[in-house]
């Protein structure tokens, strides 16, 4: 019996009946054994086939077999109901070997030419399986020449049998207070040859509760307890299971904060597995009762470990832990069933006693001493001498705990001194100076410090004066002795003030003319305003209309009088404003340099002389009455003039204050 070619020789060739293409003889038996490499199979087909036809091919036949299995018994020329001829069929070995047997019996009724066949080895596609057969690989099958290999989806690993995919299902840790876990692929069949471990690990104080839900189907055995696949549940206290079969296990209250779930499967079976919904519980904390005027959020039926609540107070109430203020409050339930913080109170907001208002007073409107939420107070300023700046003085205790004005301001109102009040009514012109009476010039300030000079009170802590009068003291402000509220220059009865700082106009040059002869003195304390101490007003924009040529201004001071001595009593003089060109011309003759009178100056006095300010009056105010407001304002500052005060054809020269309003306002607002 010929064996045919053997691997590793090239496996292909031709087979034919003895004598082919002639007729074959009787009583012939021929056997070929073909062997292909591992992973290959043999393919065979006939190009000619002509054998005696007999019932079930009992006489002459070609038999194809692979291993123990007969693939086909062939005879005749064409297939019948009970006999088969190869026709155009191709035959394949089941493995890598194919046996071909040709036999003829003792007689043939007529001559038959036999067969011719060709064979070749070809790769087996192990990945293709017949319907109903088990797949070659669990997940993915990959064919190659001479063999195949299996691979697995993500989350699986190839078992050592090289075909089964075991689930990578260990090491999952669940730390949430509730959740779900299930067998791999649930509700599809779970994988074979797998060992899964799941951990539920909650904070100490929690107790895990397990509920099996939906369906339960784990391979079982009628007599032995879960010998194939099983589910076990382990806690630090006890073990539950093993579980298998089709019945949902009962709820398991573990009384433990840690649970290990083990699921083991074998190599066979087709079951859907299991699903667990777990929850947790803990010792509840006392139910939080909201304090009066507050509410708890969130509202729950019970509060257990890690649950929290916050307290929110109604508007006008604030969180207080005893006396300690809290902006917010959240308490957390602890494992021993107690809250981590004591409950605060919602106390009505108390704005406290309102601050005292300098030069003013406060009145309780809601009730005597009532300072709680929505209480109203009324500030007012001391009448006559002070007026309230900006707001109406009505303040409400708001929810933030601050007294707040109707404009939303939390700062105190300001009692600003009333300016320009004087006891004097404008009299007729009086030759020379006249003694001032109490309250006539309450803005008058006496400045002592080397020489005698004057100034005018602005607000309650500033003095307006001439730069030349305080130039020497600009770096030693504390050397200035400032007195007010008195008429007599030498009187011991006066209000003393001290200088904090001296601000000389940056455009003033000492000993080089008197342009920009203006200065401000900041007092180190506010002075109390009364009938004898009242500030002068600064000129309004419209003030020029009261300072035209021939309009009367009043100068006051303790300067030299006609007798040549400093006045003991405060003196004043009413003098008209002089035309600017006329004044400029008067001071263009020697000994005065050209340009002595600038646009920053105004002149006042009589052409005939006799009424003037003089040395010692420097820095004092030349004031005018604003007939619309009925307040006095400073139009000029005593600056310079002729060597002989009150000289005919010469005039007193004053710093024109209206030109310096921005400078004054900037200094005062900045300092």
């Amino acid at each position: 019996t010929p064996l045919g070619p053997k691997w590793p020789e090239p496996v292909f060739g031709r087979l034919a009946s003895p004598g082919f293409p002639g007729e074959y003889a009787n009583d012939q038996e021929r056997r070929w054994t073909l062997t292909a490499p591992p992973g290959y199979r043999l393919r065979l087909y006939f190009t000619h086939f002509d054998l005696e036809l007999s019932h079930l091919c009992e006489y002459d036949f070609v038999k194809l077999s692979s291993g123990a299995k007969v693939l086909a018994t062939l005879c005749g020329q064409e297939s019948t109901d009970t006999e088969r001829a190869p026709g155009k069929d191709t035959f394949y070995s089941l493995g890598s070997s194919l046996d071909i047997t040709f036999r003829s019996d003792y007689s043939n009724e007529k001559p038959f030419t036999g067969f011719e066949a060709f064979y070749a080895a070809e790769d087996i596609d192990e990945c293709q399986v017949a319907p109903g057969e088990a797949p070659t690989c669990d997940h993915h099958c990959h064919n190659h020449l001479g063999g195949f290999y299996c691979s697995c989806r993500a989350g699986y690993v190839l078992h050592r049998n090289k075909r089964t995919c075991s689930a990578l299902c260990s090491g999952q840790v669940f730390t949430q207070r509730s959740g779900e876990l299930s067998s791999p692929e649930y509700p599809r069949p779970y994988p074979k040859l797998s060992s899964c471990t799941y951990s539920i690990s909650l904070e100490e104080g929690f107790s895990v509760i397990l509920d099996f839900v939906e369906s339960f189907d784990v391979e079982t055995h009628p007599e032995t307890l879960c010998p194939y696949d099983f589910l076990k549940i382990q806690t630090d206290r006890e073990e539950h299971g093993p579980f298998c079969g089709k019945t949902l296990p009962h709820r398991i209250e573990t009384k433990s904060n840690t649970v290990t779930i083990t699921f083991v499967t074998d190599e066979s079976g087709d079951h859907t597995g299991w699903k667990i919904h777990y929850t947790s519980t803990a010792q509840p904390c006392p139910y939080p009762m909201a304090p009066p005027n507050g509410h708890v959020s969130p509202v729950q039926a019970k509060y257990i470990l890690k649950d929290s609540f916050s307290i929110f107070c109604e508007t006008g109430y604030e969180l207080l832990q005893g006396h300690l203020p809290l902006k917010s409050f959240t308490a957390v339930c602890q494992k021993d069933g107690s809250w981590d913080r004591p409950m605060p109170a919602c106390s009505i907001v108390d704005c406290g006693p309102p601050d005292d208002l300098p030069s003013g007073r406060v009145e309780y409107i809601t009730g005597p001493g009532v300072t709680t939420y929505k209480a109203v107070i009324q500030y007012s300023c001391e009448e006559t001498f002070y007026t309230m700046k900006v707001n109406d003085g009505k303040y409400v205790c708001e929810a933030d705990g601050f007294w707040t004005s109707s404009k939303g301001e939390k700062s105190l109102p300001v009692c600003e001194p009333v300016c320009g009040l004087s006891a004097r009514t404008t009299g007729g012109r009086i030759y020379g100076g006249q003694k001032a009476k109490p309250g006539d010039f309450p803005w008058q300030v006496l400045i002592l410090g080397g020489t005698t000079a004057a100034g005018a009170l602005l607000y309650d802590n500033w003095v307006l004066t001439a730069a030349h009068a305080v130039y020497e003291q600009k770096h030693d402000a504390s050397a200035l002795d400032i007195r007010m509220g008195t008429l007599k220059r030498l009187s011991p009865h006066y209000t003393q003030a001290w200088s904090e700082a001296v601000f000389i106009h940056e455009g003033y040059t000492h000993d080089a003319g008197f342009d920009n002869d203006i200065a401000l003195i900041k007092l180190n304390n506010k002075v109390v305003i009364n009938s004898n101490i009242t500030p002068i007003c600064l000129p309004r924009k419209e003030a020029e209309s009261f300072m035209r040529t021939d309009d009367i201004g009043t100068a006051s001071g303790w300067g030299l009088t006609q007798r040549g001595f400093l006045a003991r009593n405060l003196m004043y003089v009413d003098i008209p404003i002089v035309d600017h060109q006329k004044c400029t011309a008067a001071y263009e003759k020697p000994p005065y340099p050209r340009g002595s009178v600038t646009a920053n100056m105004l002149c006042a006095g009589l052409e005939s002389g006799g009424k003037d300010s003089c040395r010692g009056d420097s820095g004092g105010a030349l004031v005018f009455l604003d007939s619309e407001t009925e307040r006095w304002f400073v139009g000029g500052i005593v600056s310079w003039g002729s060597m002989n005060c009150g000289e005919a054809g010469q005039y007193g020269v004053y710093t024109k204050v209206i030109n310096y309003i921005p400078w004054i306002e900037n200094i005062i607002s900045d300092f």
Epitope: G322, P325, K327, P342, G401
Partner: antibody
Framework: EVQLQESGPGLVKPSQSLSLTCTVT?????????WHWIRQFPGNKLEWMGF???????NYNPSLTSRISIIRDTSKNQFFLQLNSVTTEDTATYYC??????????WGQGTLVTVSA | NVLMTQSPLSLPVSLGDQASISCRSS???????????LEWYMQKPGQSPKLLIY???KRFSGVPDRFSGSGSGTDFTLKISRVEAEDLGVYYC?????????FGAGTKLELK
Amino acid sequence: EVQLQESGPGLVKPSQSLSLTCTVTGFSITSDYAWHWIRQFPGNKLEWMGFINYSGRTNYNPSLTSRISIIRDTSKNQFFLQLNSVTTEDTATYYCARSYDFWFGYWGQGTLVTVSA
Amino acid sequence: NVLMTQSPLSLPVSLGDQASISCRSSQSIVHSNGNTYLEWYMQKPGQSPKLLIYTVSKRFSGVPDRFSGSGSGTDFTLKISRVEAEDLGVYYCFQGSHVPVTFGAGTKLELK
């Protein structure tokens, strides 16, 4: 973590004002709670002086109300103690601290102020 | 003002001993909200005081569980179950229920 640091002159003359600063890091003074000044006299006696809360409201020890002022600068996360008209009796180590549900959970390291001519 | 009286003023101990410090208030320090704001502080030389216990018995974060507080009304106690070297210092009780809040004079825990 919240940290507090006191600073200011170590020597003040009688009748003058004592001014101290507490600089807070790790927590905004406007976020919550009360911010306190406490002092410890020689001999270790402790005295609470007052606090300013997250919104800027103050609460003082009644024995100091006429002399004490606590203010803050939210832009610098600082609060300040001013104690007027000091005497030698005000010589002490001055601490700033923060409260919660307790009064003084977090303290500065303290600064010694001596009142002496 | 609520006066807080501590006893003893000095407490000599050996390491490992239990220590007990008493504090008595001149009036009840139960606040009108029902809470008792009694606190214990400990101070070592050259350091600022440190909070140990608040609302009578709650331990501040980081305070070892060998420290415990108890009491009610006007009588309160701080216990240290086993004294360690780091526990030596001055202990102050404090009431925060009534303004002005007040401290005790202190108890010095020292080695025998």
